[in-house]
């Protein structure tokens, strides 16, 4: 008779995800020669121990704090790029701009970039079959927690200017309930970072609207100001031609506006 | 060899501050936790806090905490660790060490802070 | 905090012993638990890290076993350099805590 499982609202841990994530730390650490250190079963093990056995809905940052530990690295303070809800193309333009990083170029970004997984309270068992939904189950799941305390270590390292990516197509450009905006902005420490500037990706080829003057946009220079950083905004009008300039910045067409 | 050489010996009074340096050769000072553990004559080991050197992260036991301050300068490959308001029962051997595996695999030699008026 | 208790707090045994001290977690640490020797007027040595992994140059008659809340080391045949204080230590969350040592003495 098999026995009774706990069903979710979100998908099951990602297949194969042990293997997943230990070749991932080993690809990790061979590119990047400065974390050669890191021994990889190791942070597994770290990884494992976080949410193997534990509740899924009953998830603390402290249960991540070996992982937090083996897995800290050192990023250039000032080159931190942030992003909401446009992720690849941040991660396009940190693969060009290669001395700028978004929390997924870094070790722990990496490990668990587009993975799910959750354990069963009492059982060594991964469960592939349902994990917690964020707003379906509860907040206090193995993912959600994972990604809220990688965020808020990500950020109080940020220093001098940092920069977010932020999706101008969205209806709420600047979401308070988004990683960034429920984390990210309120752990940028003001004593070490003096602007947080913005950059609003435009979605239609003819969009020519200042989407710095959105709303949200506002309410977002509001919460940073507050917080006695400063805050300046950018349209990227065409982020195609914004990509391009990056890789070749010498193009005469570069010089315009993007 | 990994080598992890503190500063000397120090009396200080009741009140006053101490900062206690640590200065690590034989690798990258930069990848690896320095851990802060002091021993008060005759007693066990009680860890202060630590510092990641690349990245300034820190974290201190609650119990020294706003006391304590673990500074780290990376031209020099050198930790430091500055306890204030001394008072005597902060008399101890204090040790600086490299973490490794939420273990600590290199020790300094220690340092004995004595507080006396 | 974490407690971390061993036992005993001292014993006396004699040259080409085997001796056993244990370390008890007052939570599960999983195996993030190091073991230190100290001799007298000296800085602690790692022994073990990660519950059973010799660290570099330590004799193999030194072993760790054990996961979760429950640690072993284990010295299979005591020798003279070996009467020390032995002290285990967790890494799962801060503060990281020390056991209060156990003093092995001669026999």
């Known amino acids: 008779v098999p026995r009774w499982r706990q069903q979710w609202s979100g998908p099951g841990t990602t297949k194969r995800f042990p293997e997943t994530v230990l070749a991932r730390c080993v690809k990790y650490t061979e590119i990047h020669p400065e974390m050669r250190h890191v021994d990889c079963q190791s942070v597994w093990d770290a990884f494992k121990g976080a949410f193997i056995s534990k509740h899924p809905c009953n998830i603390t940052e402290e249960d991540y704090q070996p992982l937090m530990k083996l897995g800290t690295q050192t990023v250039p303070c000032n080159k931190i790029l942030l992003w909401s809800r446009i992720k690849d193309l941040a991660h396009q333009f940190t693969q060009v701009q290669r001395d700028m990083f978004t929390l997924e170029d870094t070790l722990l970004g990496y490990l668990a970039d587009d993975l799910t997984w959750c354990g069963e309270f009492n059982t060594s068992k991964i469960n592939y079959q349902s994990c917690p939904d964020w707003r379906k189950d509860c907040s206090n799941n193995p993912v959600s927690v994972f990604w809220k305390t990688v965020s808020r270590r990500f950020a109080e390292a940020a220093c001098d200017v940092v920069h977010v990516m932020l999706n101008g197509s969205r209806s709420k450009i600047f979401d308070k309930n988004s990683t960034f905006g429920s984390v990210e902005v309120h752990n940028l420490q003001p004593e070490k970072v003096q602007t947080l500037e913005a950059w609003v990706i435009h979605g239609g080829r003819e969009d020519s609207r200042d989407l710095c003057q959105d709303p949200t946009i506002k309410e977002l220079e509001s919460i940073i100001s507050k917080r006695n950083i400063q805050f300046s905004c950018k349209n990227i009008y065409r982020p195609d031609k914004f990509l391009q300039c990056v890789k070749n910045p010498e193009d005469s067409s570069c010089t315009s506006e993007i | 060899q990994v080598q992890l050489v503190q500063s000397g010996a120090e009396v200080k009074k009741p009140g006053s501050s101490v900062k206690v340096s640590c200065k690590a050769s034989g690798y990258t000072f930069t990848n690896h936790w320095i851990e802060w553990v002091r021993q008060a004559p005759g007693q066990g080991l009680e860890w202060i806090g630590d510092i990641f050197p690349g990245g300034g992260y820190t974290d201190y036991n609650e119990k020294f905490k706003g006391r304590a301050t673990i500074t780290a300068d990376e031209s020099t490959s050198t930790a430091y660790m500055e306890l204030s308001s001394l008072r005597s029962e902060d008399t101890a051997v204090y040790y600086c060490?490299?973490?490794?595996?939420?273990?600590?695999?290199?020790w300094g030699q220690g340092t004995l802070v004595t507080v006396s008026s | 905090d974490i407690q971390m208790t061993q036992s005993p707090s001292s014993l006396s045994a004699s040259v080409g012993d085997r001796v056993t001290i244990t370390c008890h977690a007052s939570?599960?640490?999983?195996?993030?638990l190091g073991w230190y020797q100290q001799k007298p007027g000296k800085a602690p040595k790692l022994l073990i890290y990660k519950a059973s992994n010799l660290h570099t140059g330590v004799p193999s008659r030194f072993s760790g076993s054990g996961s979760g809340t429950d640690f072993t080391l284990t010295i299979s045949s005591l020798q003279p350099e070996d009467f020390a204080t032995y002290y285990c230590?967790?890494?799962?969350?801060?503060?990281?805590?020390f056991g209060q040592g156990t003093k092995v003495e001669i026999k």
């Open positions: 060490a490299r973490g490794r595996d939420l273990a600590m695999d290199y």
């Open positions: 939570q599960n640490i999983n195996v993030w």
């Open positions: 230590q967790q890494g799962q969350s801060y503060p990281y805590t």
